[in-house]
């Protein structure tokens, strides 16, 4: 029960996380104009991974896509790539995890197969979350670097004159959405990996078999349930291990005095 809950919760958390990563990737507010020195401005600039926008005081907003590919900074391209890889891995992970869910029955899928799929999707979610966090962090680092460079330029202008025309950019809402979403996807992935441990059948799990005395004078012999040895001296008995063991119904029993007590 706890395994199913952990797996289900992991799936839901990852689903929310990946939805957040997609939302962050599509958002325009990755960097927003810093209004610290100029809170009353005619226009407000903000930029995303795919386009930059200008909003006027009237509320009118105009956005322009980055229609060039070669002219864009390498860091921006890297962030785009990280976010897309995160989305793709997350989407595949979601697809795999749907089939891995314990509460969903698909044919006669073994628990071991579900465990493997759960682990696979968990790893995919972890990598997806890390990609998103890395992408957002790279962009944030780029902003911080540019912010302090433009701050330095602002007060060391030509001939010591103060320049206040330079637009500085600070963290946009998309960065926070991306960090939270990446974290959720990561947590969901870890939960899936934990659930996998509970789903996987233990190697040392022996199936219970009930034995009947096969003759009038034969009594149960004490002995360890060893994987490779027969039970007592009866060589016809199968190995009591893994798939070789028989259940109570399958084991052939002969009528004896012990059966009619």
């Amino acid at each position: 029960m706890a395994v199913t809950a952990c797996q289900g919760l992991g799936f839901v958390v990852s689903l929310i996380g990946i939805a957040g990563i997609i939302a962050a990737t599509c958002m325009d507010q990755w960097s927003t104009q810093d209004l610290y020195n100029n809170p009353v401005t005619a226009v407000f600039n903000y930029q995303g991974l795919w386009r930059s926008c200008v909003r006027e005081s009237s509320g009118f907003t105009e956005c322009r896509g980055y229609f060039t590919l070669l002219g864009l900074p390498a860091m921006l391209q890297a962030v785009r790539a990280l976010m897309i890889v995160g989305i793709v891995l997350g989407a595949i992970g979601l697809l795999v995890s749907i089939f891995a869910l314990k509460c969903i029955r698909i044919g006669s899928m073994e628990d071991s197969a579900k465990a493997n799929m759960t682990l696979t999707s968990g790893i995919m979610f972890i990598v997806s979350g890390l990609c998103a966090i890395a992408g957002v962090s790279v962009f944030a680092n780029m902003l911080v670097t540019n912010f302090w460079m433009s701050t330095a330029n602002m007060y060391t202008g030509m001939g010591g004159m103060v320049q206040t025309v330079q637009t500085r950019y600070t963290f946009g809402a998309a960065l926070f959405v991306g960090w939270v979403a990446g974290g959720l996807t990561l947590i969901g992935g870890v939960m899936m990996c934990i659930a996998c441990r509970g789903l996987a059948p233990e190697e040392t799990n022996y199936k219970a078999v009930s034995y009947h005395a096969s003759g009038h004078s034969v009594a149960y012999k004490p002995g360890g349930f060893k994987a490779s040895t027969g039970f007592g001296s009866n060589t016809k008995n199968k190995k009591i291990y893994d798939g070789g063991a028989r259940t109570e119904d399958e084991v052939q029993s002969y009528p004896s005095k012990h059966d009619y007590v």
């Epitope: 005619a42 226009v43 200008v54 006027e56 009118f60 105009e62």
Partner: nanobody
Framework: QVQLLESGGGLVQPGGSLRLSCAAS?????MGWFRQAPGKGLERVAN????????WLADSVKGRFTISRDNSKNAVYLQMTRLRAEDTAVYYC??????????????WGQGTLVTVSS
């Protein structure tokens, strides 16, 4: 140089309707309307992107005004309904070559006066 020719202004009673027209001498990227009420600053009212027809309307006129375009005539129309006294202003047609932002507006019309009074 692009010439903008405005028409349709006049006196109208509150609750009445009016249609402003603006024709450009050649095609532009964006066309729209700004207004200036007596003793007030310039206010963006509406605009339309000529290529894809995307429109924008100020919150103060939403549900009352509509903007449309006719690419074959390089014209833009502002249909004003349920007019109020606060809509009284000089309405200016504006056009941009590459942007619709106020700072990037390349061409302005002479303006047409709209008076809403009973």
């Amino acid at each position: 140089q692009v010439q903008l020719l405005e028409s349709g202004g006049g006196l109208v009673q509150p609750g009445g309707s009016l249609r402003l027209s603006c024709a450009a001498s050649r095609s532009t990227y964006c066309m729209g309307w700004f207004r200036q009420a007596p003793g007030k600053g310039l206010e963006r009212v509406a605009n339309v992107y000529m290529r894809n027809g995307d429109t924008w309307l100020a919150d103060s006129v939403k549900g009352r005004f509509t903007i449309s375009r006719d690419n074959s005539k390089n014209a833009v129309y502002l249909q004003m309904t349920r007019l109020r006294a606060e809509d009284t202003a000089v309405y200016y047609c504006a056009a941009g070559r590459s942007s619709c932002l106020e700072a990037s507006i390349s061409y302005w019309g002479q303006g047409t006066l709209v008076t809403v009074s009973s």
